[in-house]
Interface confidence: medium
């Protein structure tokens, strides 16, 4: 496929990586929906990777929502070990691992770590609180993970998907469906075109994974969500690569993948100026 | 009592680059403990914050993703002012800018007088 | 990015009357990073409330603000013929920074 570059993977059987989703709903951020009840309900937090207590509101919603913490743990993480791939080409870091780290303008004071390209290690700063950009994880594992050098590890799950004829829309399936794509790539990649709330007709790009290709939409300005591209080879970048085509029961696979970091956040960038 | 004076042409032909300067009384451009804005204001769009600088031992800034590659907002130190530039505009463009003193305990607390500024051939 | 929906669009009522605006957030923020602006006519809008809750200097006690997580409101308590205007909320927490569309309060 002229599309994209190829990368070579193996399969190796040793540790979970961090991220274990085995739904792709477990990756919806928390909808309490628009009515005004309070139940105590519970859901998946990406970012944590724990199931946590949120409140909704009786009504709409999305499908990361359990009755109890027990059924969240059920739907959303893996106790089992299972395989984890390695690349046999070195993986290339996200384009954030490059930025300096950033305080924000806030004033609190959150130890957080960030990758130091001169000294090629995660290091600690203190963070202000808001804003900054996405060279910043909470935990130095973490950033390991995504900065450094060294083989990258990535859960090797299905998602289960449908095309809603309805709407044309993506469906998260509540059962795993059998598949011939594994998909480890951004939650994002999963969610359906949103042309958000505004006026404007720009054209962009989404990821349709049913049809894993980059289709054009209209995008209004504002709002949506983060499966929005302005280019088809940006959209094929961050989210054709997250699929795996199996070819085989085990061994030698075929991988389209970089990692990317679930976070996403508009990063600054440093500017050197002289007085005029 | 911090003030912020605009200053800047109210027309610019499309295609060309929009200049505006806000000059700060009663505080510094290099303060440690604020960052300096523009915001603009049209009708289709409402209020939307095209960027900011800011000082923390050394300089950063933040761009708007929708006009990340046509902006950039310098500092002047020696005259406590900083700019904004815009390039390639177009109508779009058209819209009254305003420049802020962003203070991180309580959002935008000074405003400049805005700019109306007219993006016409 | 964060987008922040305000309700209603148009207020319209009487000096005197209480009004009740709302603000929806895409997704959490912080309390302490959301802020509400009054602006009148060929005005800079003027910072009302910080950290969603408190009153900015100046900014008379008929004016307050709650919430938190997605939802915020700002109420006015008894309109005065200066408060007609429209209010804008703004989140910082996230970036990039976002304002709401706006809701005017309009003299019925």
């Known amino acids: 496929d002229s599309e994209e570059d190829e990368e070579h993977t193996i399969i190796t059987d040793t540790e979970l990586p961090p991220l274990k989703l085995m739904h792709s709903f477990c990756a919806f951020k928390a909808d309490d929906g628009p009515c005004k009840a309070i139940m105590k309900r519970f859901f998946f937090n990406i970012f944590t990777r724990q199931c946590e207590e949120f409140i909704y509101g009786g009504c709409e919603g999305n499908q990361n929502r359990f009755e109890s913490l027990e059924e969240c743990k059920k739907m959303c993480t893996r106790d089992n070990a299972n395989r984890i791939i390695k690349t046999t080409l070195q993986q290339e870091k996200p384009d954030f691992c490059f930025l300096e780290e950033d305080p924000g303008i806030c004033r609190g004071y959150i130890t957080r770590y960030f990758y130091n390209n001169q000294t090629k290690q995660c290091e600690r700063f203190k963070y202000g609180g808001c804003l900054g950009n996405m060279n910043n994880f909470e935990t130095l594992e973490e950033c390991k993970n995504i900065c450094e050098d060294g083989p990258n590890g990535f859960q090797v799950d299905n998602y289960g998907t449908q095309l809603n004829a309805v709407n044309n829309s993506l469906t998260p399936q509540s059962t795993k469906v059998p598949s011939l794509f594994e998909f480890h790539g951004p939650s994002w990649c999963l969610t359906p075109a949103d042309r958000g709330l505004c006026r404007a007709n720009e054209n962009r790009f989404y990821y349709n994974s049913v049809i894993g290709k980059c289709r054009p939409f209209k995008y209004s300005g504002c709002g949506g969500n983060e499966n929005n591209f302005t280019s088809k080879q940006e959209c094929l970048r961050a989210c054709k690569k997250g699929f795996i085509q199996r070819i085989s029961k085990g061994g030698l696979i075929k991988t389209k993948r970089k990692r990317k970091k679930q976070r996403v956040k508009i990063a600054y960038e440093e500017i050197f100026v002289k007085n005029m | 009592q911090v003030q912020l004076q605009q200053s800047g042409p109210g027309l610019v032909k499309p295609s060309q680059t929009l200049s505006l300067t806000c000059a700060i009384s009663?505080?510094?451009?290099?303060?440690?403990?604020?960052?300096w804005s523009w915001i603009r204001q049209s009708p289709g769009r409402g209020l939307e914050w095209l960027g900011f600088?800011?000082?923390?031992?050394?300089?950063?800034?933040d761009y708007a993703v929708s006009v990340k590659s046509r902006i950039t907002i310098n500092p002047d130190t020696s005259k406590n002012q900083f700019s904004l530039q815009l390039n390639s505009v177009t109508p779009e463009d058209t819209a009254v800018y305003y420049c802020a003193r962003h203070n991180p305990d309580l959002g935008f607390d000074y405003w400049g007088q805005g700019t109306l500024v007219t993006v016409s051939s | 990015d964060i987008v922040l929906t305000q309700s209603p669009a148009t207020l319209s009522l009487s000096p005197g009357e209480r009004a009740t605006l709302s603000c929806r957030a895409s997704?959490?923020?912080?309390?302490?990073?959301l802020a509400w602006y009054q602006q009148k006519p060929g005005q800079a809008p003027r910072l009302l409330i910080y950290?969603?809750?408190n009153r900015a200097t100046g900014v008379p006690a008929r004016f307050s603000g709650s919430g938190s997580g997605t939802d915020f409101t700002l109420t006015i308590s008894s309109l005065e013929p200066e408060d007609f205007a429209v209010y804008y909320c703004q989140q910082f927490y996230d970036s990039p920074q976002t304002f709401g569309q706006g809701t005017k309060v309009e003299i019925k």
């Open positions: 997704q959490n923020v912080s309390s302490n990073y």
């Open positions: 600088i800011y000082y923390r031992s050394k300089w950063y800034n």
């Open positions: 009663g505080d510094s451009v290099s303060s440690n403990s604020a960052a």
């Open positions: 950290d969603a809750s």
